[in-house]
Amino acid sequence: QAEESPFVGNPGNITGARGLTGTLRCQLQVQGEPPEVHWLRDGQILELADSTQTQVPLGEDEQDDWIVVSQLRITSLQLSDTGQYQCLVFLGHQTFVSQPGYVGLEGLPYFLEEPEDRTVAANTPFNLSCQAQGPPEPVDLLWLQDAVPLATAPGHGPQRSLHVPGLNKTSSFSCEAHNAKGVTTSRTATITVLPQQPRNLHLVSRQPTELEVAWTPGLSGIYPLTHCTLQAVLSDDGMGIQAGEPDPPEEPLTSQASVPPHQLRLGSLHPHTPYHIRVACTSSQGPSSWTHWLPVETPEGVPLGPPENISATRNGSQAFVHWQEPRAPLQGTLLGYRLAYQGQDTPEVLMDIGLRQEVTLELQGDGSVSNLTVCVAAYTAAGDGPWSLPVPLEAWRPGQAQPVHQLVKEPSTPAFSWPHHHHHHHHHH
């Protein structure tokens, strides 16, 4: 049969609230060298136990009896500390355990989860979470909105999750946890009501360097909108935007619009250029979320200046004219040049030269026409740019280089008939 247990004092019981500090103690009387005392919790050896062992000899001889006291300190009681505690010793070839002591947790409810501050769009549903535990159980929750209970009694309304169908003003929420020991109140969460995201961002009109855009504001609760902010970003390499990247790849052009009206003219843009635009509206509570990026494009414009460095020389019945691309912005894709020449008493001749920057003209009458002048204009798909000032044909002097060009015979009647709007900026000479 088993030897008698050496334990003369067993661990007591501890029951308290979270954070409590307590000590479990066991005592044994042994003959000979005192053993090391181990502590078990629910059958498991506590490897990092905060324990102290005191040994007192009862006689002069080492082989006399010893009193051994082991104390286990629980510094801040948590749920994980609860359970059955025993002392364990190995004596010779036998194992002894003390009678068990119990550590229990009992106090005010303890929050595992509390409502968090957040922002929500006006009139938009959201959920808040709150979770508490004892012991003792059960723990019943009571939600409060702006310090007003949302149910008649704890446990009667929503529990772990509160569904709010929408708010029109910034509000505070908290939850109370009730158990047999009393009530604990959670932190107070502030739910800030922001304007809803604007809708239906669209183009009203387009000019080569400006776009007029409009949108429909979202609801903003009891807080009027103070302004809306529009951002535009060049999107020639803006792959990130199309892929739904939240931030543009470069610094956006930002404009503020007073509201109403929910409309804004964006100026100083590049012609014939793709942009992405988005809008957010702000109330005293803060800004709405941005709309999705909307791809837009400025239209082409006409060139803003005439071709440069026009020179025109004449040698008998031939005239050689050449020029350079306008220095002024083209505002689109250059499609070509138009050339007009005219003598003192002869009708104007209009020609489309295409993208070449030089032409040799075959003049009629072997140069008998006097005071011949030439004008050149660049054009895009949007129309003609301004015509150059008339350039008189100079007589060719020997020694001047005369490039060989494809000859263009002067037609007897103008080769082209122009729609009227192409003539409006032609300054006649």
Epitope: A2, H38, I45, E47, L48, Q84, Q86, V97, Q99, P100
Partner: antibody, heavy 116, light 106 residues
Framework: QVQLVQSGAEVKKPGASVKVSCKAS????????INWVRQAPGQGLEWMGW????????KYNEKFKGRVTMTRDTSISTAYMELSRLRSDDTAVYYC?????????WGQGTLVTVSS | EIVLTQSPDFQSVTPKEKVTITCSAS?????MYWYQQKPDQSPKLLIY???NLASGVPSRFSGSGSGTDYTLTINSLEAEDAATYYC?????????FGQGTKLEIK
Amino acid sequence: QVQLVQSGAEVKKPGASVKVSCKASGYPFTDFYINWVRQAPGQGLEWMGWIYPGSGNTKYNEKFKGRVTMTRDTSISTAYMELSRLRSDDTAVYYCARSTGFFDYWGQGTLVTVSS
Amino acid sequence: EIVLTQSPDFQSVTPKEKVTITCSASSSIGYMYWYQQKPDQSPKLLIYLTSNLASGVPSRFSGSGSGTDYTLTINSLEAEDAATYYCQQWSSNPPTFGQGTKLEIK
């Protein structure tokens, strides 16, 4: 000396339950935990749970929760393990083992065969 | 749960040889325990609290280690040591065992 003696082999059909007993002697039965560990043919050891005979408190491995029940009868120093809804992969030798933070004494094992 | 991995899985050795079995834990543990299981027998405790010899275990067996790496050493192997050896931890629940190392005597 400490001894743990288990009940004999069992053959069960899938879906049935089996109850294995473990009789302790040679030490104060109510002071030490009784654990149950199983070993499938040619396999390693798997802990199923424990019972503290002094109080009847139990702790089960999550894997077996809902299917295992451990009980004891202190008057005859015997612990029991019942496993329900048996499946063919429950075929194993089931051991009871006394524990003091580890398994210092083992029963001889009970072979449970689950076969249709 | 903590996973224990033993090495080697199998070893064939001659008597009088020194044998080392290692056990690696997936997380740091405080103590390791070792068991011996012979064919058709139940496991038997060899080493407790990492390095303490259980009652009746020959002194040729020893244990050591800390953290995640533990070792069982058999100093001068005898024929009766042919068995499967298991390491075990109970630093965290559930207690787990290594997959076993089978020792064969040549």
